[in-house]
Interface confidence: low
């Protein structure tokens, strides 16, 4: 790969909609990994420190953000759906982890975010207690 | 897969305060429904994928649309797909 063209993903977790929770008694978290090149990524969901597969659906392949460009950056999305009760338990911790290849290991992004969402190379959310 | 009780809906999801990306989730729609790519290059729409909540014996179709455009709205995110008019559920303002 041309290392000059390596761009790491930005990773963000989006909280479930309260409308979905009240309408379906289920909660869908969405993880977005955006702006990366090349398209070698692996996305996984971790709940309370354990990798989960049930309730997860990830795009089969990354999406070109600008389809007309030969060397367009890529995006990938994934959904994790849990019961409303599970989401509302504030002890539950949800983490979307994206592995990206081609970066030297001393690159880092340390911007802090308010909980319940933290955006890093991985992103996480905490279950929300009822207000 | 066969979706037992399709209940198509579009929900707006909230990211962190400093995140300028808006995300819309189109979910629980029938398998015959197709999701079209956006004609707007600043709006990204995924293909539909199937999610299986094995512990609840529940499967659902879903697709995600997102954009950094300030005027991007979930009401029009999937406008190029043929979806029922009453599928958009506005999110109540959080009182937390």
């Amino acid at each position: 790969e041309d290392l000059k063209k390596v761009f790491p993903p930005k990773v963000a977790v989006f909280e479930p909609s309260e409308a979905e929770i009240s309408h379906t008694q289920k909660a869908t978290l969405v993880c977005l990994a955006t702006g990366f090149y090349p398209d070698h990524v692996e996305l996984s969901w971790w709940v309370n420190g354990k990798e989960v597969h049930s309730g997860v659906s990830t795009d089969p392949q990354p999406l070109k953000e600008q389809p007309a460009l030969e060397d367009s950056r890529y995006s990938l999305s994934s959904r994790l759906r849990v019961s409303a009760t599970f989401w509302h338990n504030p002890r539950n911790h949800f983490r979307c982890q994206v592995q990206f290849y081609g970066l030297s290991e001393d690159d880092e992004w340390t911007e802090d975010r308010d909980k319940p969402i933290t955006q890093k190379i991985s992103a996480e959310a905490w279950g929300r207690a009822d207000c | 897969p066969y979706i037992q009780n399709p209940d198509p809906a579009v929900y707006q999801l909230r990211g962190s305060k400093s995140n300028d990306t808006s995300v819309c989730l189109f979910t629980d729609f029938d398998s015959v429904m197709n999701v079209s790519q956006s004609k707007d290059s600043d709006v990204h729409i995924t293909d539909k994928t199937v999610l299986d909540m094995r512990s609840m014996d529940f499967k659902s179709n879903g697709a995600v649309a997102w954009s950094n455009k300030s005027d991007f709205a979930c009401t029009s995110a999937f406008k190029d797909s043929v979806i029922p008019a009453d599928t958009f559920f506005p999110s109540p303002e959080s009182s937390c």
Epitope: P8, G49, Q97, E108 | -
Partner: nanobody
Framework: EVQLVESGGGVVQPGGSLRLSCVAS????????YGWYRQAPGKEREKVAH???????DYADSAKGRFTISRDESKNTVYLQMNSLRPEDTALYYC???????????WGQGTLVTVSS
């Protein structure tokens, strides 16, 4: 960058005990998850135990009832207490941490445990 240093390995007789320690060179609040893994000669690396935020723990079947993972945030240290050791527990034991900043997946160099009479 996080550095993980394991210690506590050694030679022990079957039925004996060892306590492995893993010290992180970084504030523990930046680490979401710790794990102990092991690799026996000629075999693949396998999970032994995990501990995550809220001290939620998870054990491999082979470790249940015999091994205990714990951590001491004040010392930035995670422990693996191993009791009733068996010859098949002989392996190189590695500590792993998942942190909140890149590169988020860290491994120690390993500490050797030999169970032999």
């Amino acid at each position: 960058e996080v550095q993980l240093v394991e210690s506590g390995g050694g030679v022990v007789q079957p039925g004996g005990s060892l306590r492995l320690s893993c010290v992180a060179s970084w504030e523990v609040h930046k680490i979401n998850f710790y794990g102990w893994y092991r690799q026996a000669p000629g075999k693949e690396r396998e999970k032994v135990a995990h501990i995550s935020i809220g001290d939620q723990t998870d054990y491999a079947d082979s470790a249940k009832g015999r091994f205990t993972i714990s951590r001491d945030e004040s010392k930035n240290t995670v422990y693996l207490q191993m009791n009733s050791l068996r010859p098949e527990d002989t392996a190189l034991y590695y500590c792993r941490a998942l942190s909140r900043i890149w590169p988020y997946d860290y491994w120690g160099q390993g500490t050797l445990v030999t169970v032999s009479s």
